[in-house]
């Protein structure tokens, strides 16, 4: 009997109102044995995956994913999903990426370091669970 | 299908250098940690060192056996996989295998390649 | 560094035993252990990861249990290309060290 996979969760370090050049890394978790991560931009058309996985704990594994300089079109709405055989995982929440101009004062709206960034998490649409993982052969226009 | 070539073992004198390559194809390697194990005639396996993708800015791992004097390194233009091999011992005598990192897990290895550090 | 004990270092069994060989880590590592088969001349092989997960193309005669620090590899019927070497490994923290590996002979 295939096991229940537990949804992803992500987070952006160091927050998520990230200043324009600055960089961003998404952090996507889940189960040990994952397989392949992949961090989806607003809809599954535009997409990042990795085999990259370490432990986050005795019971999780995480994939990292780093925008070196982001950019006014790195803004938008982001979520996780993962490839565990036989089978991939709901998506996760939303997180939505801000890109601002430049540093701003005390009352920048800036996330705590280390956030999943609270409010500016969305609820995931699940109603699709049909992806192949892009390294055996299915590609996407990357996130960067 | 999944291939990983070692090449550049050989023979070696006590604190001479050897460079090993390997190979990768039939997978997306620049997604993919990278290792090298290696197991010395009628021994077991030794984890050698290991290299992260670009999301975790290439970190490098090693054994304390070969820190310092090991330098494990990749070209993602080229596929490709080098362990630099300095100051070699003769207990550094052994097959070294290119093995790829998949879930945290050694799912792929190459046939290996000999070392051989002998005066 | 996370040890890892295995037990027994070589058995002698027959075609259609059942065989159980055993990992023990030195600290909890939860699930983070592989099981490789290796044998003569030949590069290892992933049989389990996470503990429990069987790799791809891997017959289901071969089966992986425990977490924390208790593990066990079972082959439910052996069979006479299972003869070979396996080894444990943890991958929860570098070192990423290896079991002394086990071999399983003809009886």
């Known amino acids: 009997q295939e096991e229940d996979l537990p949804r992803p969760s992500i987070s952006a370090e160091p927050g998520t109102v990230i200043p324009l050049g600055s960089h961003v890394t998404f952090v996507c978790r889940g189960p040990v044995g994952v397989q392949t991560f992949r961090l989806e931009r607003d809809s599954r058309s535009t997409y990042n995956d990795t085999e990259d996985v370490s432990q986050a704990s005795p019971s999780e594994s995480e994939a990292r994913f780093r925008i070196d300089s982001v950019r006014e079109g790195n803004a938008g709405l982001y979520r996780c999903i993962y490839y565990k055989p036989p089978k991939w995982s709901e998506q996760s929440d939303y997180l939505e990426l801000l890109v601002k101009e430049s540093s701003g004062g005390p009352d920048s709206p800036d996330t705590e370091p280390g956030s999943s960034a609270g409010p500016t998490q969305r609820p995931s649409d699940n109603s699709h669970n049909e992806h192949a993982p892009a390294s055996q052969g299915l590609k996407a226009e990357h996130l960067y | 299908e999944v291939q990983l070539v070692e090449s550049g073992g050989g023979l070696v004198q006590p604190g001479g250098s050897l460079r090993l390559s390997c190979a990768a194809s039939?997978?997306?390697?620049?997604?993919?940690?990278m290792n090298w194990v290696r197991q010395a005639p009628g021994k077991g396996l030794e984890w050698v060192a290991r290299i992260r993708t670009k999301n975790y800015n290439y970190a490098t791992f090693y054994a304390d056996s070969v820190k310092d004097r090991f330098t494990i390194s990749r070209d993602d233009s080229k596929n490709s996989l080098y362990l630099q091999m300095n100051s070699l011992k003769t207990e550094d005598t052994a097959v070294y295998y290119c093995v790829r990192d998949r879930a945290g897990f050694f799912a792929y290895w190459g046939q290996g390649t000999t070392v051989t550090v002998s005066s | 560094d996370i040890q890892m004990t295995q037990s027994p270092s070589s058995l002698s069994a027959s075609v259609g035993d059942r065989v159980t060989i055993t990992c023990l880590a030195s600290q909890t590592i939860g699930t983070w252990l592989g099981w490789y088969q290796q044998k003569p001349g030949k590069a290892p092989k992933l049989l389990i990861y996470a503990a429990t997960s069987l790799a791809e193309g891997v017959p289901s005669r071969f089966s992986g249990s425990g977490s924390g620090t208790d593990f066990t590899l079972t082959i439910s019927s052996l069979q006479p290309e299972d003869f070979a070497t396996y080894y444990c490994q943890q991958l929860y923290s570098t070192p990423l060290t290896f079991g002394g590996g086990t071999k399983v002979e003809i009886k």
């Open positions: 039939g997978f997306t390697f620049n997604i993919n940690a």
